[in-house]
Amino acid sequence: SNNKRAPYWTNTEKMEKRLHAVPAANTVKFRCPAGGNPMPTMRWLKNGKEFKQEHRIGGYKVRNQHWSLIMESVVPSDKGNYTCVVENEYGSINHTYHLDVVERSPHRPILQAGLPANASTVVGGDVEFVCKVYSDAQPHIQWIKHVEKNGSKYGPDGLPYLKVLKAAGVNTTDKEIEVLYIRNVTFEDAGEYTCLAGNSIGISFHSAWLTVLPAPGREKEITASPDYLE
């Protein structure tokens, strides 16, 4: 096609995970899939400076057709910010990843004590639950609501009924996953909420309760509801 176009990202989902916490000796791959016309070129920076092969033992691989940078057997000195710069004569775009190389003994995720905290709000109000997670390896985080089916919290197998409200795994590391927002709260939103964090060693979770109170001035309306009439 003759339509000239500045560089653009073709698969932002593959770029959502900005923070990569990787055990020493593992392989790291950063991708910046892009398009443009003419086809853009890609170069990599480490901590804002040109990234050269001699900057690390064993060098690195660039797979231009996959828009990727690959570093094998990472070591602590590989920690830092890696920026892909994709450019053609019509423009330039860039994206930065942060690499942390983990040498500690990996442990199951640790959740900050007291979080999430119990909360209460009135009908129509907003509430947020916060969960702070510390994990050597990238954790996968879920927010879970304990729900009822046919008036029961537990199934015939004795297991609780659960609904995953929000989840993040390999493609997401945004801090927003650590906060669960509930807008325009209803009575049905009351109950137990669980923040679950897992990694390759195990799973940890903390729970909190949401109490929903009638909105001020609505008591009459609630009392007059047909559900309460004989």
Partner: antibody, heavy 124, light 112 residues
Framework: EVQLLESGGGVVQPGRSLRLSCAAS????????MHWVRQAPGKGLEWVAV????????YYADSVKGRFTISRDNSKNTLSLQMNSLRVEDTAIYYC?????????????????WGQGTMVTVSS | DIVMTQTPLSLSVTPGQPASISCTSS???????????VYWYLQKSGQPPQLLIY???NRFSGVPDRFSGSGSRTDFTLKISRVEAEDVGVYYC?????????FGGGTKVEIK
């Protein structure tokens, strides 16, 4: 039925290589971390390695670091252990063990399901 | 690494009598989520280990209620209230809080 079946064991000379496999069935393999644990003849249990559910994280015991590589193929429900530069002290039964899942667990979060094991003998 | 020390090395028990195995960890296994990550296994001759107790005191499904786990932080105990012939084998404790996961040296239980 949840099952793990190891294969690939055998007799090998010191310095040579061997690749173990573990076929998983009866559960969603791609949602679980997986481990290798070994047991030398007449001895206790020794943890060898773990791989996360998606293969992005791997950890090894110091005794095998740099020689063994754990990997997985979620499309084939298979866990592998590539063992290079084998030593006499690597002689053991190697067990494949299911680790933690990705979601809420009502019960143990892993180390509940073990394979029958495959024997590796390193001898000259 | 967390060291798991198990005692005794072996135990000879009369059927119907109680038995107790101790395990000590070099660091606390009490996690921030309030759980204590010690597991107990029984390995019968020629078989892989089978899970008995998880998270200190929870019996795994299908495990008879004569098995119980207790303890806190660094000191743990597995009790068999009335030993039966099928309980013979080697018992192991394991810490499941950090890698490398580590096991106790094992306690061999036999019937008198």
């Amino acid at each position: 039925e949840v099952q793990l079946l190891e294969s690939g064991g055998g007799v090998v000379q010191p310095g040579r290589s061997l690749r173990l496999s573990c076929a998983a069935s009866g559960f969603t393999f791609s949602s679980y971390a997986m481990h290798w644990v070994r047991q030398a003849p007449g001895k206790g249990l020794e943890w060898v390695a773990v791989i996360s559910y998606d293969g992005s994280n791997k950890y090894y015991a110091d005794s095998v670091k740099g020689r063994f590589t754990i990997s997985r193929d979620n499309s084939k429900n298979t866990l592998s252990l590539q063992m290079n530069s084998l030593r006499v002290e690597d002689t053991a039964i190697y067990y494949c063990v299911r680790g933690a899942g990705r979601g809420y667990t009502y019960g143990p979060d892993g180390f509940d399901i073990w394979g029958q094991g495959t024997m590796v003998t390193v001898s000259s | 690494d967390i060291v798991m020390t198990q005692t005794p090395l072996s135990l000879s028990v009369t059927p119907g009598q109680p038995a107790s195995i101790s395990c000590t960890s070099s660091r606390s296994l009490l996690h921030s989520d309030g759980k204590t990550y010690v597991y107990w296994y029984l390995q019968k001759s020629g078989q892989p280990p089978q899970l008995l107790i998880y998270e200190l005191s929870n019996r795994f499904s299908g495990v008879p209620d004569r098995f119980s786990g207790s303890g806190s932080r660094t000191d743990f105990t597995l009790k068999i209230s009335r030993v039966e012939a099928e309980d013979v084998g080697v018992y192991y404790c394991m810490q499941y809080i950090e890698a490398p996961l580590t096991f106790g040296g094992g306690t061999k239980v036999e019937i008198k």
